[in-house]
Interface confidence: low
């Protein structure tokens, strides 16, 4: 389907897209979810822990699962990013297609905080993120190969 009026990413709720790598415009890192729950960025697209599954829970709202880690990206109440074994309310993000064709992922529970990576490859605290920052811009790339 076409992009919905609100500019959010449109794909059928409950359906999985193909696995993706989320490439961050800030430093060129791929979002990585480790089996121990740590979250960071890495430049090597061959790293198995950058393969992510995005699932729509409703229009424009996704959960982000690390395929190898079998964990879900979560934004904690103090702004930390980690990956949990179970889906919780902290695992839902508003996915939006920005005018520059990059995506942003904003926490549904903590609605002014975004998923973001620093230029060092570390994640950025949600409390330090905001619209317009390069750190919050991600380009979904196919990870089928």
């Amino acid at each position: 389907p076409a992009l919905p009026e609100d500019g959010g990413a449109a794909f059928p709720p409950g359906h999985f897209k193909d696995p993706k790598r989320l490439y961050c415009k800030n430093g060129g890192f791929f979002l990585r979810i480790h089996p121990d729950g740590r979250v960071d960025g890495v430049r090597e697209k061959s790293d198995p822990h950058v393969k992510l599954q995005l699932q729509a829970e409703e229009r424009g709202v996704v959960s982000i699962k690390g395929v190898c880690a079998n964990r879900y990206l979560a934004m904690k109440e103090d702004g930390r990013l980690l990956a949990s074994k179970c889906v919780t309310e902290e695992c839902f993000f508003f996915e939006r297609l920005e005018s520059n064709n990059y995506n942003t992922y904003r926490s549904r529970k903590y609605s002014s905080w975004y998923v973001a990576l620093k230029r060092t490859g570390q994640y950025k605290l949600g409390s330090k993120t905001g619209p317009g920052q390069k750190a919050i811009l991600f380009l979904p790339m196919s990870a089928k190969s």
């Epitope: 409703e58 424009g60 109440e77 919780t88 695992c91």
Partner: nanobody, 130 residues
Amino acid sequence: QVQLVESGGGLVQPGGSLRLSCAASGTEDGRLLTLGGSWFRQAPGQGLEAVAAIGAGDRGGATYYADSVKGRFTISRDNSKNTLYLQMNSLRAEDTAVYYCTALYERQPQLAATKVARKWGQGTLVTVSS
């Protein structure tokens, strides 16, 4: 044990209407469907297709429709009855399928990080034929 039970399917002529219902029972907290509900369908020999969805929020939430049903199908819900609906008008032969409802629900709403689960119904057959 949370269960979703669909009803309202059956045989209808092209151009006719049906209203599917998806009733939830056995909820631990009475909040089933408030996180969002969807209708999917599976035609014979085909894959699962998302037909319509309604988002989170006690007062309704955003709706999603597949292009093939826009303007003909309407999704709604009644939280007081814990029921999800799909009103299907101007039915066509290609709408013939088993229709499934699915819902997200909170298992433990008192926790700061609420556990969320997805449930599926058993399906109801809709046949559009003259």
